[in-house]
Structures are given as C-alpha cells and as structure tokens.
C-alpha cells in the first residue's frame, strides 16, 4: 500500500491506477479528471478590499469606492458586529477585538462614522463629525506574540518558544521550505517551493518544534499561488497553504501578524530571519535545528546597483542582510518569514531568492508581504 501510494494514484469510476507523475500535469488522465483536482491552484489578485489596517495603532480605514478615497473609522456608534464585518471583509473568521484610540494631531485622513450594508462596511451618509475624537483600533486575530524574545546576535540556534509560527513544509517527508502560520487554517510560504511538485497530496506541514522531523505532520487541503506574470518572472513569489484541519494554538504553535498596509521599513531597520536551510552555500546540509539571525533592511537602490541585482529587485520585493555580508537565508529557508517586531511580530517578507548566500553585495531578496495583502484577503474571503 505504501509503495502503491508513493508511485501511483487511484482513479475512481472505473477504479484504476495511474503513475503519480501524471498528477497535475495539465492532462486529464482519470476519466473524471480527479488527477487534476488536488493541485496547486492560481488565484487572481482580485478587486480592492475596501477595508485596511494602519500601522498607527492598527486603526481601521474604509474605502469610499465612489471617489477612491480612504477614510479613518470614527469610534462613534462602532459595534462588535461592525468589527466582525470588517474582519470578515479581510477574510478572518476569528472573533475580533477593538477599542477607541484618540485621534492624533498628524491624522491626515478624514474621519467618518461607519455603518454596514450587504456585509460590507460603508461610510454613514451625511454623518456628522467624529464627536468622540477617537478612531477604531481593530485586531482581527491575536497574533505575533511569543513566549521568548530572541537575543540580538549574529546567528544562533533558535527555540520554538521564540518563533511559534515557524513551520517546516515537507514533500514526501523531506523538508523543502519554511513557512509561517497566519491563522488556524492558513500557512504563508513562497510559490517557488511548489515548482517541482504541484500535487497537493504529498505536501505536509510540521508545526510546533524547532527540530526537523520531530513533530507530527498536518495534511494540506489547498495550495494557492498568484497567476504568473511573465513581465516580472520573479514577482509574485507567494503562496498560501490551507490546512485540512484547523490548528490548535499553544505556546509553541501561534500565528504571526500580517504587516500593516503602510508598513514602510526604512534602511537599517532591524529584522529577523529563521530557517532550517543550508548553513553553507553550495554544500553542507540542512540544519536539523532551527537557526535564527538578525539582519537589517537594505535600501532597494543599493540592492539594485550594478554590482548587485542590477534592477531585478522590483517594488514588490525587499532586500535584507548585513552590509558586510555573511548573514543570510539560503536553500531550504525559502518560504520562511522575514520578521519585524513592533508591538507584535509581523511577517514583512518571505524568503524568495538571491545570488549565493551571504555575499556582501548580494543580500537576500524577499517577497514584500504588504504588496500582497489584497491578494491574501481575497483568497481568504473566497475560502471562508
């Protein structure tokens, strides 16, 4: 049975086996086409999600689709039902929390009272000014909190207590990529992890440990990527994995927060990377133990210089490393998080590509997660 499962796939009606390599090859080899059903699926960028959260205390903003203008949500008459609607618009299914925060002097968007129409937030027609003088601070999910704070050093062994959202993504029980837990159903990783194997069956996720292979595997229901853009072949290196059963959160299994839409990180901002990847470029082996390292944002202009990536780093990517080189992600770290700590930990990047590992002029290149928030929300909404 194990050998059959490894090399063959069972078609139904009539029952017969086909070689597993014929799964997800674009050809209907089973009469009912089920060999092309459980494959990596692409999902378009989709329409603009009309709500978003700002780095200014996670305050809620709402889009006026008629004008294309964004407005901050006033706390006047804001309710739990409205909070739930806002979070559902972003694809969250958990119970949100919200509070009033005072409007600051640098508030630049106008502030409006919010109402609901057809399960979407709307600006209240002819609402008065914001009498409370407060905005809505909204949290759709408790995220980005770990039991232990890492020490700031170069590279060291990591504890799952520090990074409870880190997962190992495995094919046929072999570690292929890292990933991050975003909520009980969803894991964030890189699309290029699935280039070789596009069938969902043999992919598994392992969560809750810092040692490879020492923790139970979780079945995957769906793997979703963005449609390929031939104009920018390295763009869109992002994937969402939907788990067959929701995770139960604990001290060692917790979600990381998505970044805010306006999370602009300036050069030299400290960040963290983690993974079980190669410890040496072009050699060595996967690390059995999770490793962590502190890096920093590297200016995109510097990263695109003639002695570096020569313009290949697009607006939807970011660079991180240390100016002198030597600390970087490598093969096997792909898909893992590039993390920023404010009040909580946020996954601002996904380990994507680079030339070599740890070179001074060619730091790691990461998918900029804030550029894909709309896509993430649209995927989640479609799967609610």
């Amino acid at each position: 049975k194990v050998i059959l499962d490894k090399y063959y796939f069972l078609c139904g009606q009539p029952l017969h086996f086909i070689p597993r390599k014929q799964l997800c090859d674009g050809e209907l080899d089973c009469p009912l086409g089920e060999d092309e059903e459980h494959c990596v699926k692409s999902f378009p960028e989709g329409p603009a999600v009309a709500v978003r959260l700002s780095k200014d205390r996670s305050t809620l903003q709402v889009l006026d689709s008629a004008t294309g203008n964004w407005f901050s949500a006033c706390f006047d008459n804001f309710t739990e039902a409205l909070a739930e609607t806002a979070c559902r618009q972003m694809g969250y299914s958990s119970k949100p929390t919200f509070r009033a925060v005072e409007i600051g002097p640098d508030q630049d968007l106008d502030v409006v009272e919010i109402t609901e129409n057809s399960q979407e937030l709307r600006m209240r027609n002819s609402s008065g000014p914001c009498l409370s003088g407060s905005l809505v601070s909204l949290h759709c999910l408790a995220c980005g909190k770990s039991l232990k704070t890492p020490r700031v050093v170069g590279v060291e062994e990591a504890s799952v207590d520090s990074w409870p959202w880190q997962v190992s993504i495995q094919y046929d029980k072999q570690h292929v990529c890292g990933g991050s837990i975003l909520d009980p159903h969803w894991v964030l990783t890189a699309a290029h992890c699935f280039r070789k194997h596009t069938d969902v069956f043999n992919w598994k996720v392992r969560a809750g440990s810092d040692k490879l292979g020492s923790f139970p595997s979780l079945a995957v229901a769906k793997i979703i990527i963005i449609e390929f853009n031939p104009m920018y072949p390295k763009d869109n290196d992002i994937a969402l994995m939907k788990l067959q059963f929701p995770l139960t959160f604990s001290g060692t299994v917790r979600p990381i927060c998505l970044p805010f839409f306006d999370e602009e990180l300036t050069p030299a901002t400290p960040l963290w990377i983690i993974g079980w990847g190669f410890t040496k470029q072009n050699g060595g082996k996967m690390s059995d133990i999770l490793l962590q390292a502190s890096v920093q944002v590297i200016d995109s202009t510097r990263c695109n210089a003639d002695d570096a990536y020569q313009g290949e780093v697009t607006e939807k990517m970011m660079c991180a490393g240390i100016p002198e080189g030597g600390v970087d992600t490598c093969q096997g770290d792909s898909g893992g998080p590039l993390m920023y700590q404010s009040d909580q930990w946020h996954v601002v990047g996904i380990v994507s590509w680079g030339y070599g590992c740890g070179g001074p002029s060619t730091p790691g290149v990461y998918t900029k997660v804030s550029a894909y928030l709309n896509w993430i929300y649209n995927v989640w909404k479609a799967e609610l």
Epitope: C74, I103, G104, P105, D106, Q107, D110, V111, V112, S126, S127, G128, P129, C130, L131, G133
Partner: antibody, heavy 120, light 107 residues
C-alpha cells in the same frame, strides 16, 4: 473642489446686529466643523467659535459669549454667524473656515472674508 | 486660555535666504499646531499642520518642527511669493488661539 462663499460687506451702526452667511460646497457639509475667525484692520487673527453643522452644537470664545450666535441650515449647506450689540471695535473682516472631521483638527479651507464696518 | 507668542514680530530677508520663525505656547499642546500664511487682502492659507506635516500642494521649502511648547517654521530658500504674514495656531484646546503674527518683508 471645496469652496466657502461668504455674504457681502456690511456697514452697521453701534448697537445693531449683523448676520454673515457662509455657503459651503464641494464636500459633505455635515461631516466637517466650521469655525469663525475675525481680523481687525492691521491686526492679527482672532478665533470666535465653532459649530458642528450636523447637530448644530456650538462652542464660543469667552470674549464673544452672549453676543455671538452660530447657526446652520443643512438644506442649503450654509452656516451663519450673528454678532449683536455691535461696537466700533467689532469692525473687522470675518472669515468662516472649515475644520476637519474631528474637533481638535486644524482649519484647512477659508472663505474669502466679509468686511463688517461699525460706524455711527 | 493658551497664549501663543511668535517671534520675531517682523523680519526682513532676501530671496534665497533661510528664514526661521518661532512660536511658543504657554502650556504643552503636544503637536496640535498649525502654521498659516496670509497675504494682504486675502484669507489665510494652511501651510503646516500637526507641527511638522506639510499640507498638500504646499512647496517643500516650508517645514515645521517642535512639540510641547516650542515650535518653528522654516523656509529653506525664500522665494518672492513667500513675503507675507505668518501665524501659528493651537488646536489643542478651546478657545483656539493664534500667535500675533510675523511679518516677513523684502530686505
């Protein structure tokens, strides 16, 4: 675009009242506060008070309390400022000015001003 | 009431000069401060809000700084159209109060 158009110049006798209007357009009238500010000839700016065009509530500077009344008409998107018991030192240009959509916000748009001359 | 004191009351400068005007509040107003420019016979125009945020459409040679009680407006390189009177205003509490103004003249 946002526009605040004020009524024309007035000449009044001491002890009389004046009512200046300010018609707003180009934005949702009820969402933004309206301030009144005056400027005597060759002098600086002096804040008189604020009105919430949605509910009609007001707050006046102590100096004008009892003499000033600010009202609004939402059907015509117009605010009014009436100043009574006029004296010669009330001769000034009176401006309406739009506040943003929260109380502590600054003023971002101004009317063109209405000159009120108080003279016997 | 919060008193706003501007200095200097007037100053003469030349095109291309860097000019700084200061505004002091009688108590802390956090960053609830705006700067306005007024030309003769015209209504004031908002330049800076929240002490340092540039209003849309205002040239970048204008900048503001400060918080608490001490604030400055800086014009990095004076242009002919910048000769006017400048006012600061606090919006921290009612009544909103203005500074007495700074008249900027051509030297």
């Amino acid at each position: 675009q946002v526009q605040l158009v004020q009524s024309g110049a007035e000449v009044k006798k001491p002890g009389a009242s004046v009512k200046v209007s300010c018609k707003a357009s180009g934005y949702t009238f009820t969402t933004y506060y309206m301030h009144w500010v005056r400027q005597a000839p060759g002098q600086g700016l002096e804040w008189m008070g604020i009105i919430n065009p949605s509910g009609g509530s007001t707050s006046y500077a102590q100096k004008f309390q009892g003499r000033v009344t600010m009202t609004r008409d939402t059907s015509t998107s117009t605010v009014y400022m009436e100043l009574s018991s006029l004296r010669s030192e009330d001769t000034a240009v009176y401006y309406c000015a739009r506040g943003r959509s929260w109380y502590r916000s600054n003023v971002d748009y101004w009317g063109q001003g209405t000159l009120v001359t108080v003279s016997s | 009431d919060i008193q706003m004191t501007q200095s200097p009351s007037s100053l003469s400068a030349s095109v291309g000069d860097r000019v700084t005007i200061t505004c002091r509040a009688s108590q802390s107003i956090s960053s609830w401060l705006a700067w306005y420019q007024q030309k003769p016979g015209k209504a004031p125009k908002l330049l800076i809000y929240a002490a340092s945020s540039l209003q849309s459409g205002v040239p970048s040679r204008f900048s503001g700084s400060g918080s608490g009680t001490d604030f400055t407006l800086t014009i990095s390189s004076l242009q002919p159209e910048d000769f006017a009177t400048y006012y600061c205003q606090q919006s921290y509490s009612t009544p909103r109060t203005f500074g007495q103004g700074t008249r900027l003249e051509i030297k």
